[in-house]
């Protein structure tokens, strides 16, 4: 798979492959994988990809199921790259506060908050 | 501050305090703090709170500015709790795939993806 495929297209294709291979993937009925108990997905990327690793090691490879796991690995690479960009730019306090304000604003309006 | 205050109310109050104390917080003109370069805030919580720590250590404490940093510390505690819940529940593959599908769906529709 060319790594040049836009990430947005990669995610769409992966969703389709996930549907296609669902039956094969759930073949192991005894396997248990950690599942986050909330919907703030970005907080759980590490655990999600650990789960994907567990699933891959238990899945018979071949055909387009390999493409699914390759795609998921590229998505992980993208997310790791985004995480690296969390601390790259050193800015004045005012700009940090604008970012913090936006973060709290998004937390206020978009996060699923259980008290 | 009672830690029993609902997190959503805590976030709202913190946004207000951030506005109130902005002038005091930006008093150090030469201080530089890492600012994430994308809007996927949840990926960057660690760096955001490191930045808050840097800011707190450089800010003259007293009055309600202390309450601001106390609030931010409680928000961090909430997020750390959410992170702990990422791997607590072990579930069947089918359930993990449902979560993965939802994660990719959200990534597809809500994330700001720069290729």
């Amino acid at each position: 798979i060319p790594t040049e495929i836009p990430t947005s297209a990669l995610v769409k294709e992966t969703l389709a492959l996930l549907s296609t291979h669902r039956t094969l993937l759930i073949a192991n009925e005894t396997l248990r994988i950690p599942v986050p108990v909330h919907k703030n997905h970005q907080l759980c990327t590490e655990e999600i990809f650990q789960g994907i690793g567990t699933l891959e090691s238990q899945t018979v490879q071949g055909g387009t199921v390999e493409r699914l796991f390759k795609n998921l690995s590229l998505i992980k690479k993208y997310i790791d790259g985004q995480k690296k960009k969390c601390g790259e730019e050193r800015r004045r306090v005012n700009q940090f506060l604008d970012y913090l304000q936006e973060f709290l604003g998004v937390m206020n309006t978009e996060w699923i908050i259980e008290s | 501050i009672p830690t029993e205050i609902p997190t959503s109310a805590l976030v709202k109050e913190t946004l207000a305090l951030l506005s109130t104390h902005r002038t005091l917080l930006i008093a150090n003109e030469t201080l530089r703090i890492p600012v994430p370069v994308h809007k996927n805030h949840q990926l960057c919580t660690e760096e955001i709170f490191q930045g808050i720590g840097t800011l707190e250590s450089q800010t003259v404490q007293g009055g309600t500015v202390e309450r601001l940093f106390k609030n931010l510390s409680l928000i961090k505690k909430y997020i750390d709790g959410q992170k702990k819940k990422c791997g607590e529940e072990r579930r069947r593959v089918n359930q993990f795939l449902d979560y993965l599908q939802e994660f990719l769906g959200v990534m597809n529709t809500e994330w700001i993806i720069e290729s």
Epitope: Q95 | P36, I112, E114
Partner: antibody
Framework: QVQLQESGPGLVKPSQTLSLTCTVS??????????WSWIRQHPGKGLEWIGY???????YYNPSLKSRVTISVDTSKNQFSLKLSSVTAADTAVYYC?????????WGQGTLVTVSS | SYVLTQPPSVSVAPGQTARITCGGN??????VYWYQQKPGQAPVLVVH???DRPSGIPERFSGSNSGNTATLTISRVEVGDEADYSC???????????FGGGTKLTVLG
């Protein structure tokens, strides 16, 4: 490499509103490390900062122009815009858009706007 | 609001040292940025944070800042250095940007 390009009319009538758009390429306007700014330069004079905006919509304006200036951002188009109302001949200048981190990193080539009837 | 004062012009012979000043109340407590602008072109940063040079800017360009004056120094001046030079600071706590009026550097001869 981030590139910026100003666009808009080169001639505006007195008392009307000057409108310019800056299109950002080679980078995202949602980059949290940057503000997006407008600067102008009157013929033969120094640089004058007009204002800047954060992707979240926070704005900062030059106090001397604040009553007439509006800067907005459209993250979906990777653009930000300047509106300057009630213009006079004194607003004739080259208008630059620029990215602003700790300093002005990247600039557009500038566009001359003349205010004349 | 904060005011930065620059001399309108500075003249220097090739090979000599040019010093361009930027005056402001207690400017030494602020970070100063210097831009070079040639006719018909957009400005280019030559010094940031008082004395740091961006990559691609010759070592001949240096800066200093203390008290009420910041200085851009160009050693071994070349004809190609002829341009307008502007200083810039952030005005706290408003976080407004302030530019000096600009200095025209003329290289004689």
């Amino acid at each position: 490499q981030v590139q910026l390009q100003e666009s808009g009319p080169g001639l505006v009538k007195p008392s009307q509103t000057l409108s310019l758009t800056c299109t950002v390429s080679g980078g995202s306007i949602s980059n949290g490390g940057y503000y997006w700014s407008w600067i102008r330069q009157h013929p033969g004079k120094g640089l004058e900062w007009i204002g800047y905006i954060y992707y979240s919509g926070s704005t900062y304006y030059n106090p001397s122009l604040k009553s007439r200036v509006t800067i907005s951002v459209d993250t979906s188009k990777n653009q930000f815009s300047l509106k300057l109302s009630s213009v006079t001949a004194a607003d004739t200048a080259v208008y630059y858009c620029a990215s602003l981190g700790n300093w002005f990193d990247y600039w557009g080539q500038g566009t001359l706007v003349t205010v004349s009837s | 609001s904060y005011v930065l004062t620059q001399p309108p012009s500075v003249s220097v012979a090739p090979g000599q040292t040019a010093r361009i000043t930027c005056g402001g109340n207690n400017i030494g407590s602020k970070n100063v940025y210097w831009y070079q602008q040639k006719p018909g072109q957009a400005p280019v940063l030559v010094v940031h944070d008082d004395s740091d040079r961006p990559s691609g800017i010759p070592e001949r360009f240096s800066g200093s800042n203390s008290g009420n004056t910041a200085t851009l120094t160009i050693s071994r001046v070349e004809v190609g250095d002829e341009a307008d030079y502007s200083c810039q600071v952030w005005d706290s706590p408003s976080d407004h940007v302030v530019f000096g009026g600009g200095t025209k550097l003329t290289v004689l001869g």
